[in-house]
C-alpha cells in the first residue's frame, strides 16, 4: 500500500537507508512530500515485524517498487493509489 501524507511536522527521518527490503517483509510504504517544515521528500517503510525504516528516495529499489505498485494499482483499481491525509 502506498500512502502520501501531508503533515505540518518537521522531518521524520534522521537516518535513511538504501538497503534493499524484499516485498514480503513490507506492510506499507508512507510517502511524505517535501514542504511544511521538511525540505526533502521522505519515504517510510513499515515492515511486517512492526519496525520502521526510512528509505532514501533515490534508492533504486524503492523507485522501482513504487513504479510497479503504481502501475499495478492503476490497472486494477478505479481509485487513485495515493491516500491524502491532511491534518
Amino acid at each position: 500500500v502506498l500512502e502520501v501524507y501531508y503533515t505540518s511536522l518537521r522531518c521524520r527521518c534522521v537516518q535513511e537507508s538504501s538497503v534493499f527490503i524484499p516485498r514480503r517483509f513490507i506492510d506499507r510504504i508512507q510517502i511524505l512530500p517535501r514542504g511544511n517544515g521538511c525540505p526533502r521528500k521522505e519515504i517510510i517503510v513499515w515492515k511486517k515485524n512492526k519496525s520502521i525504516v526510512c528509505v532514501d528516495p533515490q534508492a533504486e529499489w524503492i523507485q522501482r517498487m513504487m513504479e510497479v505498485l503504481r502501475k499495478r494499482s492503476s490497472s486494477t483499481l478505479p481509485v487513485p493509489v495515493f491516500k491524502r491525509k491532511i491534518p
Epitope: 538497503v19 516485498r23 519496525s51
Partner: antibody, heavy 120, light 107 residues
Framework: EVQLQQSGPELVKPGASVKISCKAS????????MNWVKQSHGKSLEWIGD????????IYNQKFKGKATLTVAKSSSTAYMELRSLTSEDSAVYYC?????????????WGQGTSVTVSS | DIVMTQSHKFMSTSVRDRVSITCKAS??????VAWYQQKPGQSPKLLIY???YRYTGVPDRFTGSGSGTDFTFTISSVQAEDLAVYYC?????????FGAGTKLELK
C-alpha cells in the same frame, strides 16, 4: 555473535525419514528467519524454505513441499527440518542459515552443515 | 522462479590480480542480490548484500555492483585465501535462488 549448531551426519535407508536440528545460541534477536539450504555433492545451493520462530510463519520452495517439513521450538531456540520418503536424490549436505529481518535480508549466519546419505 | 546465471564455472587468476565474476538474473531483481564465498569443507559466508553493501568484517577488496538483471562481484587484488567458490543469490522474491557458482582458481 550468533552460533548455529547442527546435528550430526545421518545415514538412512531409502524410503525412511530423517529429522535434523539446528540450535541457535549467542545474541539471537527475535526477528530472524531460519532458512534451510540443500547442497548436493559438488553442486550449487538450493533454498528449501524458511520459518519465522516469532510467529511460526513458514514459506517453502514449491520444489520441496511434501519432502521437507520445517518446525521450531522457540523455547530452546532450535529449528528442525524433517525429510521424508528419502531417495538417493536427497543425499546432500543440509545447512541452516539465518537472516535478521531488521536489516540484511541475506543469510549472514550459517550452521556447519549436516550430511545426509541415503543408501541401502 | 528467478534463475541466476553465473556464466563462468571456473575462473583462473593470479595473486594480486583483479577479477570480476558476473551474474545475470532471469528477471528484474532491482538491487536484491547477495554474494557468498564458500571454501572446501566450509559453510558459505556472506560477503555482499543488497548488490553493493559489504557485510561486516569483509575486506574492502571485495565489492559488488549492478541492478536490474546484471550484477558483478569484484576482487580488486586477489589473495591466496580468496580461492573459493562464489555464489550469487537473489533476495528479491521467494523461492530464493542461487547461481551455479564460480570457482576461483590459480593459473
Amino acid at each position: 555473535e550468533v552460533q548455529l549448531q547442527q546435528s550430526g551426519p545421518e545415514l538412512v535407508k531409502p524410503g525412511a525419514s530423517v529429522k535434523i536440528s539446528c540450535k541457535a545460541s549467542g545474541n539471537t534477536l527475535t526477528d530472524y528467519y531460519m532458512n534451510w539450504v540443500k547442497q548436493s555433492h559438488g553442486k550449487s545451493l538450493e533454498w528449501i524454505g524458511d520459518i519465522n520462530p516469532n510467529n511460526g510463519d513458514i514459506i517453502y520452495n514449491q520444489k520441496f513441499k511434501g519432502k521437507a517439513t520445517l518446525t521450531v521450538a522457540k523455547s530452546s531456540s532450535t529449528a528442525y527440518m524433517e525429510l521424508r520418503s528419502l531417495t538417493s536424490e536427497d543425499s546432500a549436505v543440509y545447512y541452516c542459515a539465518i537472516y535478521y529481518d531488521p536489516y540484511y535480508h541475506a543469510m549472514d549466519y550459517w550452521g556447519q552443515g549436516t550430511s545426509v546419505t541415503v543408501s541401502s | 522462479d528467478i534463475v541466476m546465471t553465473q556464466s563462468h564455472k571456473f575462473m583462473s587468476t593470479s595473486v594480486r590480480d583483479r577479477v570480476s565474476i558476473t551474474c545475470k538474473a532471469s528477471q528484474d531483481v532491482s538491487t536484491g542480490v547477495a554474494w557468498y564465498q564458500q571454501k572446501p569443507g566450509q559453510s558459505p559466508k556472506l560477503l555482499i548484500y543488497s548488490a553493493s553493501y559489504r557485510y561486516t568484517g569483509v575486506p574492502d577488496r571485495f565489492t559488488g555492483s549492478g541492478s536490474g538483471t546484471d550484477f558483478t562481484f569484484t576482487i580488486s587484488s586477489v589473495q591466496a585465501e580468496d580461492l573459493a567458490v562464489y555464489y550469487c543469490q537473489q533476495q528479491y522474491s521467494v523461492p530464493l535462488t542461487f547461481g551455479a557458482g564460480t570457482k576461483l582458481e590459480l593459473k
